[in-house]
């Protein structure tokens, strides 16, 4: 059962796993949610009746029954983890805590103009977990405007104390706001020879990389595969760090793989969700339950639905035994990973999918695309929406992309002369315009947010957000697309598609079926040569064939330029402008979405 509200003046008795320090009960709940075993917590707020050394303690708790006895205690705030909930979860914490000093290892001290600048510095520093900033009112003159970057083993403060005229806060890496590079490559036959901060068992290098990503101290990792010569180290995932933030030594070793934390990519690739099955593999751990199940998929479902289950092993039924049902072993451990991994016993193992809700919905795999042909099939581009205007009569106006359950990203120029959002309707999950009848459900638009600097498409800043009146329930036919990571600025996308219901030639009409075209990206230098009368800025991105023939056209505006990278679709561009349609040496010009990620997050995450 999902319980989100906090219980004031209440303490849960027993079940302690560990104690951490958090600046608020709300953040304690987040820490509990991300901890592999925590189901409940008790936070102690500052209070004259409480010993100051206990202020801001966050006691993480577990219970076989998923609840614990409640005791009244002033200043205690208790609650449940969000593991039991089905809604999307985020570790992003933008709060600034006034007059609190969050203690940790102060490894960097510098002058900053504001707390915001200090927070940005922390977000863009690979080691930083949180910071404390002494304001200009701080009593000690030499400490004023000092920004202290801090880290700890756990990623949370080692203590929190009251201190006048300072503010503290967390790194915004988990809000997708870091400019740090996103390095997704896994390097085969490579060992990073740096200090290990932890080690866990993992079935493959991808899981090892994801574990590294949500481990607070891990910057890179080395994984020893099951063919690694030293038997005791097989399937071992070594979580590593270094002072520079990069591996100091790379050693060539067969059957080892190494890679980097994906903390700067976490909003555009799954980092919590281990969805694969591992055949002929047994995961060992503390047994939670043994249940009969028809298949390994059914076993995974059982594990996902059991809140304490972290991973499972399924042993298929021996012929005609137990109505064809095999045994599903639901398991857990102290760190969420198997204590040992064995091969050759015939089991099929995997992980709970409960953690998938901690990943951005946009990373969910969509059904395979039909390659070739220009007409799309249902569910092929589930983020694509058709934006209709009802004035003077109802018609398709522009495309758009679902980027959140209440947010559509589109082009600013679509709203030329539009005074009110009341005339707009957003239809999602649509393949054919002919599906839209008078009684077809749509999303009303609550607000149109146009970039302040937008003047006309050709001048740039051609980007707008639509806040919907109601939330989108994600399904196979309507779900979000990932925004590109700021750390991905240097990625060269090779699998990019433009979609829309727009014209197929200059003098045409809106198409009934959603069209698609694979179009190569063009460098800005090349694009500038083709548009001498315009300024192609770094905030624009171009795509098109030299010989023309495939391009966006009238009616496609605001729609996505979607690029697939590492099996995940990213919203790389927004259809903006071009000279004619599909003309030779006239590429389409798109709003370069990565340059607006901060703006998008600022607008969509505003309180």
């Amino acid at each position: 059962e999902c319980v989100t509200q906090l219980l004031k003046d209440t303490c849960f008795e027993g079940g302690d796993i560990t104690t951490v320090f958090t600046p608020s009960a709300k953040y304690c709940q987040v820490v509990c949610t991300y901890h592999p075993r925590c189901l409940l917590f008790t936070f102690t707020a500052e209070s004259p009746s409480e010993d100051p050394t206990r202020w801001f303690t966050c006691v993480l708790k577990d219970s076989v029954t998923e609840t614990l006895p409640r005791v009244n205690r002033t200043a205690a705030i208790s609650g449940y983890s969000f593991k039991q909930c089905s809604h999307q979860i985020s570790a992003c914490n933008k709060d600034i805590y006034v007059d609190l000093d969050m203690k940790g290892i102060n490894y960097n001290s510098s002058v900053a103009k504001s707390a915001q600048e200090c927070q940005e510095r922390c977000t863009d520093d690979v080691h930083c977990h949180f910071f404390t900033y002494a304001t200009r009112q701080f009593p000690s003159l030499e400490h004023r405007n000092i920004c202290l970057l801090k880290h700890t083993q756990t990623g949370t403060p080692t203590r929190i104390t009251k201190l006048d005229k300072v503010v503290s806060g967390f790194s915004l890496k988990s809000c997708a706001l870091s400019n740090l590079a996103c390095i997704r490559d896994i390097f085969p036959n490579t060992v990073f020879a740096d200090s290990n901060i932890d080690s866990v068992m993992a079935p493959d290098a991808f899981v090892c990389g994801r574990i590294c990503t949500h481990h607070p101290g891990c910057l890179f990792f080395t994984f020893f595969s099951q063919e690694w010569p030293k038997e005791s180290q097989r399937n071992l995932c070594l979580l590593k760090t270094s002072e520079s933030g990069l591996p100091s030594t790379r050693i060539k070793k067969s059957k080892a793989l190494s890679g980097f934390s994906l903390q700067s990519c976490r909003h555009s690739i799954p980092v919590f969700c281990h969805s694969s099955f591992y055949h002929d593999t047994d995961f060992l751990g503390e047994e939670l339950d043994i249940v009969a199940a028809k298949s390994h998929e059914a076993c995974q479902k059982l594990c996902t639905n059991a809140v304490r289950c972290q991973f499972f092993t399924y042993t298929p039924a021996q012929a005609s035994c137990n109505e064809g049902k095999g045994k599903c072993y639901l398991k857990l451990s102290s760190n969420g990973s198997p204590t040992k991994i064995l091969h050759g016993r015939g089991g099929i193992s995997g992980y709970t999918l409960r953690l998938c809700k901690m990943d951005n919905e946009c990373t969910t795999k969509i059904k395979p695309r039909i390659v070739g042909g220009t007409a799309s099939v249902r569910g092929e581009w589930p983020w694509q929406v058709t934006l209709h205007t009802t004035s003077p009569t109802q018609r398709h106006l522009c495309g758009g992309s679902i980027i959140g359950n209440q947010w559509i990203l589109t082009a600013a120029h679509c709203f030329y002369g539009v005074e009110s959002p009341k005339i707009l309707r957003v239809y999602s999950g649509i393949l054919n315009q002919s599906e839209i009848k008078e009684d077809t459900s749509f999303f009303g638009v609550q607000e149109i947010i146009i970039h302040d600097q937008y003047k006309m498409a050709e001048s740039g800043y051609d980007i707008a957000l639509l806040k919907l009146e109601t939330t989108v329930n994600y399904t196979d036919s309507q779900r979000p697309i990932c925004l590109p990571s700021k750390g991905d600025r240097n990625v060269i996308y090779t699998d990019c598609w433009v979609t829309g219901w727009g014209y197929r030639k200059l003098r045409d009409k809106i198409q009934n079926t959603l069209q698609k075209a694979k179009i190569p990206l063009v460098t800005n230098e090349e694009c500038q040569k083709r548009y001498r009368g315009h300024k192609i800025t770094h905030k624009m991105i171009c795509a098109g064939y030299r010989e023309g023939g495939k391009d966006a056209c009238k009616g496609d505006s605001g729609g996505p330029l979607s690029c697939k990278h590492n099996e995940v679709w990213h919203l790389v561009g927004i259809t903006s402008w071009g000279e004619g349609c599909a003309q030779r040496e006239r590429p389409g010009v798109y709003t370069n979405v990565v340059e607006y990620v901060d703006w998008i997050l600022e607008k969509t995450q505003a309180v």
């Epitope: 003077p392 106006l397 522009c398 082009a411 600013a412 120029h413 679509c414 709203f415 030329y416 002369g417 539009v418 005074e419 146009i450 302040d452 600097q453 937008y454 003047k455 006309m456 498409a457 050709e458 727009g502 200059l506 966006a552 056209c553 009238k554 009616g555 496609d556 505006s557 605001g558 259809t575 903006s576 402008w577 071009g578 004619g580 389409g588």
Partner: antibody, heavy 118, light 111 residues
């Protein structure tokens, strides 16, 4: 409601500088997207767009007149100004200011008649 | 510059009948969503009044007997049924690119 009102010298001599003021109310030139244009119309003829100033002080000019035009604003007093240097009889016209947000010219002033005569 | 050519230069239409005014642009005034073509009505001694924006959208408070159509380079303004009050000059105007330009105008009167 939105109103715009032009004012000018009425009559001036060739080679002089024409100074026009557009005083407006009902909107602010601090609002992103907002802008004001000057448009003129010689008697019995068509309309000619001259210049535009945006909320952020970015300016656009008709290239055929650019060297003679200066557009500016005083946001606190809700006024926009246009200066045309070295006027000629061909500059005799009714001068309009019009509001342009992120869309068409929706609101216009009544216009001020300017006659260039020696 | 984008040149707008209006036709006819003058037009007389009977009350209750349809008036059609054309406007041709020297190059396309469309982008990937919008036709940046507007229509204005001007009566003697008055400023222009917005009738149609983005080729087919009715301006605020404009009667439904006015309608606009077209895309690319060819646009038209329709008035049906023609009323006494519609006697005026009509101008097309493009907002696609600076310099923003106007057509030469069409004088509409009652036959």
């Amino acid at each position: 409601q939105v109103t715009l009102k032009e004012s000018g010298p009425g009559i001036l001599q060739p080679s002089q500088t024409l100074s026009l003021t557009c005083s407006f109310s009902g909107f602010s030139l601090n609002t992103p997207g907002m802008g004001v244009s000057w448009i003129r119309q010689p008697s019995g003829k068509g309309l000619e767009w001259l210049a535009h100033i945006y909320w952020d002080d970015d300016k656009r000019f008709n290239p055929s007149l650019k060297s003679r035009l200066t557009i500016s604003k005083d946001t606190s007093r809700d006024q926009v100004f246009l200066m045309i240097t070295s006027v000629d009889t061909a500059d005799s016209a009714t001068y309009f200011c019009a509001r342009k947000g992120r869309g068409p010219f929706t609101y216009w002033g009544q216009g001020t008649l300017v006659t260039v005569s020696s | 510059d984008i040149v707008l050519t209006q036709s006819p230069a003058s037009l007389a239409v009977s009350l209750g009948q349809r008036a059609t005014i054309s406007c041709r642009a020297s190059e396309s005034v469309d982008n990937y969503a919008i036709s940046f073509m507007n229509w204005f009505q001007q009566k003697p001694g008055q400023p222009p009044k917005l009738l149609i924006y983005a080729a087919s959208n009715l301006g605020s408070g404009v009667p439904a007997r006015f309608s606009g159509s077209g895309s690319g380079t060819d646009f038209s303004l329709n008035i049906h049924p023609m009323e006494e009050d519609d006697t005026a000059m009509y101008f097309c105007q493009q907002d696609k690119e600076v310099p923003w330009t106007f057509g030469g105008g069409t004088e509409l009167e009652i036959k």
